[in-house]
């Protein structure tokens, strides 16, 4: 049925889906706080621009009776149920914030006549790529894939003189929502990553992973996995690792690596950690004291979703344009807006761009150091530490295939 949008005559409402099944186990109270903070800032920004309008949020809660797994497994129907609730109440805002689960976002996008923008903190999977009215404010799998291909091909850095074309991917099915979709994208036979690699095998059992570490007949020296250092330790323990093994640990939403007093454990010496830059600038190879540990990416994405809506509302109101139009619904992309922690850039498809950081463990200091950064917006790698104190021979990353000469 056609649902009227509460989105005109100086009153603009945001519908916030508060789903029991969520990409991250963040208390709903934290998400509410984030949304309310965003509203206070948006109201201030609009007032400063001379726009005397009302902006509010309506929180739509799931009853939690049926869809109570707490993770994303039963989110498909929960999302549609919430939309039905909105429809029955005949109350839809100018914009929909949430859901965060790939399953629910994909299904909601598929099953609704979306003439309004959808902003998601999550929806990491490839199935949510290239959706015309969907904006994603946490790095989706496609961005990770593009970094990996770019890094694999790189062969002109002092510390990486070989192109790589092979990889193992460890994926045991117990991953968090973000990791599940990141690894799913790497596993998919039709993905860009698979297309660009000559050899790729998915390791699904702990024993498979453990055996590869010292297997002389392994087909690749590179293993990609997703999670934190503790996850790796549980799997690897203190087992011996062949000297030319490189583990790429994808841990985007974890900034513990940037804390002042963190020392890298010994089992991390063969590991390169891929994470997100915690600040707007991270140019020197040893971390500045001005970087704070703030594990809050999920709630922050909700907050930035509110600020993004405020940004677009301001532009359309200043131009005298209608908000309840397809033009507005399709406008949440190819732009930069002032987010809570600084400027936020969205690409042509409404996906957030960011600076990814590849870290290594210094054998001298036992600290995490920045090896390189990668700008997802321009798909470009920027080396930071030209002479890293690696564990690998000659302070260079090894070839991906043992015994193969320069490529």
């Amino acid at each position: 049925s056609q649902v009227s949008q509460n989105c005109h005559n100086g009153s603009y409402e945001i519908s916030v889906l508060m789903m029991g099944n969520s990409a991250f186990a963040e208390p709903l109270k934290n998400l509410e706080d984030a949304v309310n903070e965003g509203l206070e800032i948006v109201r201030g920004r609009l007032q400063n621009a001379g726009l005397n309008v009302t902006v509010n949020a309506t929180f739509m809660y799931s009853d939690g009776l049926i869809h109570n797994s707490g993770d994303c497994r039963s989110s498909t129907c929960e999302g549609l149920d919430l939309l039905r609730k909105i429809s029955n109440a005949q109350r839809m805002g100018c914009v929909l914030i949430g859901p965060s689960c790939t399953y629910s976002t994909f299904q909601m996008y598929l099953d609704t006549e979306l003439s309004y923008p959808m902003i998601s903190a999550g929806s990491f999977g490839l199935s949510c790529d290239y959706k015309e009215t969907l904006t994603r404010l946490m790095s989706p799998a496609r961005k990770l894939m593009y970094f990996l291909v770019n890094f694999w091909k790189t062969n002109d850095l002092p510390f990486k003189t070989y192109s790589w074309s092979t990889s193992y991917v460890y994926k045991n099915g117990t991953e968090t929502e973000d990791c599940f979709w990141y690894l799913n994208a790497l596993e998919a036979s039709v993905s860009y990553f698979s297309h660009e690699l000559g050899f790729k095998v998915v390791l699904r059992q702990d024993k498979e992973f453990q055996d590869i570490l010292m297997d002389h007949n392994r087909k690749s020296n590179v293993i990609i996995m997703c999670g934190g250092p503790e996850f790796l330790y549980k799997l690897k323990g203190d087992r011996a690792v062949a000297e030319d093994i490189v583990i790429i640990l994808v841990d985007l939403f974890n900034d513990q690596y940037f804390e002042d007093n963190v020392t890298a454990p010994d089992y991390m010496k063969n590991v390169l950690v891929l994470t997100l830059s915690p600040g707007n600038s991270l140019l020197n190879s040893s971390f500045s004291r001005n970087l704070s540990p703030t594990k809050r990416d999920f709630a922050l994405a909700y907050l930035n979703g509110i600020l993004l809506f405020g940004h677009m509302l301001k532009i359309f109101l200043e131009n005298g344009e209608n908000i309840t139009t397809p033009k507005f619904a399709h406008a949440f992309r190819n732009l930069t807006f002032e987010g809570y922690d600084g400027p936020v850039t969205l690409d042509d498809w409404g996906d957030v761009d960011s600076t990814m950081v590849l870290l290594y463990t210094s054998v001298d200091t036992k600290k995490y150091k920045v090896l390189l950064t990668y700008d997802t917006h321009v798909n470009k790698t920027y080396p930071v530490d030209m002479s890293p104190t690696f564990t690998w021979k000659n302070s260079k990353l090894p070839n991906d295939i043992t015994g193969r000469g320069p490529q």
């Epitope: 984030a34 903070e37 800032i41 704070s292 709630a299 907050l303 002032e338 809570y340 922690d341």
Partner: nanobody, 115 residues
Framework: EVQLVESGGGLVQPGGSLRLSCAAS????????MTWVRQAPGKGLEWVAK????????YYADSVKGRFTISRDNAKNSLYLQMNSLRAEDTAVYYC????????WGQGTLVTVSS
């Protein structure tokens, strides 16, 4: 350990001024939005003013707009609230808080506006 310590409160006559300070420690002050919040006797919490990490944006509740000014000095890890033209209804305990979820609070400083 994160600490926020407010000071500068006291008894002032209507129409008078006060300057509140908040000394922050235990975290990188320059990376956080900060907010002044107040609680009047027998009332709920009300946000008063907020300021971006670099001081580039400042917002005020309608009830204090034009009378109060929020500022910060990142070099000194300090937050300030200049309160002018004080009214009886500004009587409250004033707290400084950190970030969107206001995860850390000080002990507060009492401002009493009375003749």
């Amino acid at each position: 350990e994160v600490q926020l310590v407010e000071s500068g409160g006291g008894l002032v006559q209507p129409g008078g001024s006060l300057r509140l300070s908040c000394a922050a420690s235990g975290f990188t002050f320059s990376r956080y939005w900060m907010t002044w919040v107040r609680q009047a006797p027998g009332k709920g919490l009300e946000w008063v003013a907020k300021i971006r990490h670099d001081g580039g944006e400042k917002y005020y509740a309608d009830s204090v707009k034009g009378r109060f000014t929020i500022s910060r000095d990142n070099a000194k890890n300090s937050l300030y609230l200049q309160m002018n033209s004080l009214r009886a209804e500004d009587t409250a305990v004033y707290y400084c808080t950190r970030d969107y979820n206001k995860d850390y609070w000080g002990q507060g400083t009492l401002v009493t506006v009375s003749s």
